[in-house]
Every structure is written in C-alpha cells, then in structure tokens.
Amino acid sequence: MMTGTIETTGNISAEKGGSIILQCHLSSTTAQVTQVNWEQQDQLLAICNADLGWHISPSFKDRVAPGPGLGLTLQSLTVNDTGEYFCIYHTYPDGTYTGRIFLEVLESSVAEHGARFQIP
C-alpha cells in the first residue's frame, strides 16, 4: 500500500531573468527513493538517480542546476518557462509518486506593478 505523500511548492511565480527552486518532498513512507525525474509538461528536464547521480537534459544544461537535495533550480527564466512541472519519485517497494508545481514567469515590470498595487 502506498502511504507516502508528496509536498510541493505548489503555485509559484518568479521574475523573467531570475531563478526559482522547484522542490518536492516525499514523506510518510519508509520506501527507498531510487530515482526522481523532473519534467516540464512532457519534456524531461533532469533525472536524479540514487546510484548514478544527476543527469540534466542537454537542452537545459546551461540554465538548470541540480539541488538543493533532490530539488531543481531553474535559472535565466523566460516567459516560455511558464507552465506545469512534475516531480516523479520512483520508490521501492511503493512505486511511483508524482507532484505538480505550476510556475508563472512574470515580466519584471508586471511583477513590480503587482507588488505595489493590490486589488482590494
């Protein structure tokens, strides 16, 4: 029986040109994590394997940094990075757990505007 739960950073926003840490945490299970996949929609960003370490997809190599822990840091953000991200935990003996994060990348001026003027 799968008893674990995935905690994620949920819905997050960041400024264009900035960076953001995507994090998921698997808790409430003693299952061994054998691999974590990070995906954006259907595109693989990175794999963190318990025996082989990290593999960053070549197309993301220059602006993805592994960590902290099993998390992933996205750098030099563009508006095209807006969307859904998934952390897929492969565990033994439980099986697969999936977490979802929605990232919105904002134009700098929009982010500043949003911070200064709040709609009541």
Epitope: S27, C48, A50, L52, G53, P66, P68, G69, T73
Partner: antibody, heavy 117, light 107 residues
C-alpha cells in the same frame, strides 16, 4: 569503487593562499556535486560550498565567499579549492565529499592546513 | 539559514544500551535530514539519508525517524565500534548546514 583522493598536508604563512585538490575515481564527476567541509580541531563540521562540475554551478556558504574559490577540471576528474588571505582561523582539516541528491555518501581523507608564522 | 541543534552534546552509554540522538531544525525541512558518524581521526560516514532511509553497508541497528523540525537517530544495542561523533545535516535549502554534533562515549 568510488574514491576521493585529497592532496597532502599544507603549512602556510598568514596572508598566503593555498590550493588543494580532490581527485575522483570510480564515477562520473559531472553527475555529482562536490562539496567542501571544514573541521577545526575538536570541532564540528562546517559546509563551505559546493560545485557541480556538470555545468560549473557553485553554491557558497556566505561566510566563505571571498575566502574560498571552488573549481573543477572535468577532464582530470578533479575538484579544487583555493583559500586566500589565510589566518589562524583557517587552520583545519578540509574534506571534499560528493553528493548526488541522496546525502554526502563518499568523503575524501581530508587535507590538513596549518597556518603559522 | 537553517540552524540544526543536536542534543545531548555528550551521551555516555554502556555497550548493549539502546540510545536516541536528537536533531532539531530552526524551521521545517520536511525529511531533508541526513545523519553521519565520525570516529576519531577518520572522515565522516553517511548513516541515514532523508530522515529514515537506510544506507547500504550500514548495520541495521541504526535507524532514523522524524519530519518537519524534530529528528531522531536511534541505535539499537550500541556496540563498541559505534562510539564517536554523530552529526545531522540538512539539504532542504542552501546553504547546507550541519548540527553541532553529539559525542557518544563509553560510560
């Protein structure tokens, strides 16, 4: 077999700089963080920073920014740490340790640095 | 920065005793907590990863538990080779940090 082989004991003068190395074998250095940890005699462990040789990303403990510089030569499977403007407080054993997301699972034997005039 | 506080600083036990070492985080770190053992004049050794996950080659008498801010390393029936220092470390956020350590000594 995974091994991290660190360079030998260093004796340096105050104000000098030293560079130590950590030679990795038995795995791909580009798939793991290489962290550096300081341990003063009889004291605890202090994280200095880490480098991810896969794309040269670095993270530093704010306390060691300007003191430590981390580099890696992937073709030689080696990580390096340079310490500058040495003082007595820098006298310690420095460990390199690899991390692939699942804890720091392999450690070097340590490089002892003594700063003395 | 996440501050990790270990207690007690020193634990005096007799071989065969079972002991619990504590590590408390200054903020929630989920289960991103690892335990290390360091014997005198040796490098640290990873004992437990992610609070409770076992490490290949580590005796089964070592176990970990906890989540959030409170974590425990348990040693079931301490053996003479277990005496030394124990450190916790978090990988929840940069900068990584270590606890101050617990010294396990022979009574």
């Amino acid at each position: 077999e995974v091994q991290l082989q660190q360079s030998g004991t260093v004796l340096a003068r105050p104000g000098a700089s030293v560079k130590m190395s950590c030679k990795a074998s038995g795995y791909s250095i580009t798939s793991y963080w290489m962290h550096w940890v300081k341990q003063r005699p009889g004291q605890g462990l202090e994280w200095i920073g880490g480098i991810y040789p896969g794309n040269s990303n670095t993270n530093y403990n704010q306390k060691f920014k300007g003191k430590a510089k981390l580099t890696a030569v992937t073709s030689a499977s080696t990580a390096n740490m340079e310490l500058s403007s040495l003082t007595n407080e820098d006298s310690a054993v420095y460990y390199c340790t690899r991390e692939g997301g699942y804890g720091m699972d392999y450690w070097g034997q340590g490089t002892s640095v003594t700063v003395s005039s | 920065d996440v501050v990790l506080t270990q207690s007690p600083a020193t634990l005096s036990v007799t071989p065969g005793d079972s002991v619990s070492l504590s590590c408390r985080a200054s903020q929630t770190i989920s289960n991103n907590l690892h335990w290390y053992q360091q014997k005198s004049h040796e490098s640290p050794r990873l004992l437990i990863k992610y609070s409770s996950q076992s490490i290949s080659g580590i005796p089964s008498r070592f176990s970990g538990s906890g989540s959030g801010t409170d974590f425990t390393l348990s040693i079931n029936s301490v053996e003479t080779e277990d005496f030394g220092m124990y450190f916790c470390q978090q990988s929840y956020s940069w900068p990584y940090t270590f606890g101050g350590g617990t010294k396990l000594e022979i009574k």
